[in-house]
Interface confidence: low
């Protein structure tokens, strides 16, 4: 039985410093019923940098409408890159509950950043 | 108005195989998660089968798991359910129903009646 | 798999009087419940969803409270069109999508 796919297309994003990044994340249901988050890095140490239910993230804005109920592109553009924000982003859907369990993740994209250029 | 029609019923023999079809109008097929949900007779409601807005994913009850294939064809805006190795106890009303965003039914068929008789 | 138990099996009422129904989940849903009414010979239809918020075109006699496990539907001075059978639904957690075994509130 094939299950929930998420898709993140790129494995690679290079964007000079300043600019924005946009990373790419489709899943392909809305079921199980539950938030998206990105985080960058994977394990204990992952910073979280959007769930879908909460926020604000001044920094981030989502690229489709996630709010539209049947909305399945949880594509996001992070502001004002610096190298700060290098590593690895991950698309993660989550399964509703008390908690929000993990449910699947994306393979990932490696964001770089590149110098400003002068 | 949404609209679901469902159609293929009838009696078969246990062991015998159906085709049930359900016309979708009124609203953009391809935006909505479809089910399928059955009622034998006098008896409550059972979901039988689940598949994403693109047809990428589906899901199946236990009790018919390996039986049946729920199916759709977003071109000609139609859901489909295949009953093989039917039993008598999968005798019932067969309705079609649109989930919302959050995988309840806000939309269902008037059904179509499955007989498994010998 | 989540088990849904209704209560009670039937409810014998006069119009005019309020029912209340309730739905008891065997896992915490948090307040992923649906309600849907069914008549004799008709496809159920939606009430309630989210616990508590009503269905486009649901008149506000019917009201649905609870999260977690325990769930209420009340249906207030009860009209002649009432009397039917109802479900709840969870889909907090799934597959598979469970129903109740539904609760019919007949005239007495």
């Known amino acids: 039985e094939e299950e929930l796919q998420i898709i993140q297309p790129d494995k690679s994003v290079s964007v000079a410093a300043g600019e924005s990044a946009i990373l790419h994340c489709t899943i392909t249901s809305l079921f199980p019923v539950g938030p998206i988050q990105w985080f960058r890095g994977a394990g204990p140490a992952r910073v979280l940098i959007y769930n879908q239910r909460q926020g604000p993230f001044p920094r981030v804005t989502t690229v489709s409408e996630t709010t539209k109920r049947e909305n399945m592109d949880f594509s996001i553009s992070i502001s004002n890159i610096t190298p700060a924000d290098a590593g690895t982003y991950y698309c993660i859907k989550f399964r509703k509950g008390s908690p929000d369990t993990e449910f699947k993740s994306g393979a990932g994209t490696e964001l770089s950043v590149r110098a400003k250029p002068s | 108005d949404v609209q679901l029609v469902e159609s293929g019923g009838g009696v078969v023999r246990p062991g015998e195989s159906l085709r049930l079809s359900c016309a979708a109008s009124?609203?953009?097929?391809?935006?909505?998660?479809m089910s399928w949900v059955r009622q034998g007779p006098g008896e409550g409601l059972e979901w039988v089968a689940g598949i994403s807005l693109r047809g990428g994913v589906t899901w199946y009850a236990d009790s018919v798991k390996g039986r049946f294939t729920i199916s759709r064809d977003n071109s000609k805006n139609t859901l489909y359910l295949r009953l093989f190795s039917l039993r008598t106890e999968d005798t019932a009303i067969y309705y079609c129903?649109?989930?919302?965003?959050?995988?309840?039914?806000?939309?269902w068929g008037l059904g179509t009646l499955v007989t498994v008789s010998s | 798999e989540i088990v849904l138990t209704q209560s009670p099996g039937t409810l014998s009422l006069s119009p005019g009087e309020t029912a209340t129904l309730s739905c008891r989940a065997s896992?915490?849903?948090?307040?992923?419940l649906a309600w849907y009414q069914q008549k004799p010979g008709q496809a159920p239809r939606l009430l309630i969803y989210?616990?508590?918020s009503r269905a486009t075109g649901i008149p506000d006699r019917f009201s649905g409270s609870g999260s977690g496990t325990d769930f209420t539907l009340t249906i207030s001075s009860l009209q002649s069109e009432d009397f039917a059978v109802y479900y709840c639904q969870q889909y907090g957690n799934g597959p598979p999508l469970t129903f109740g075994g539904g609760t019919k509130v007949e005239i007495k």
């Open positions: 896992q915490n849903v948090r307040s992923n």
């Open positions: 009124g609203f953009t097929f391809s935006d909505h998660d």
């Open positions: 989210d616990a508590s």
């Open positions: 129903a649109r989930e919302s965003w959050n995988t309840f039914f806000d939309y």
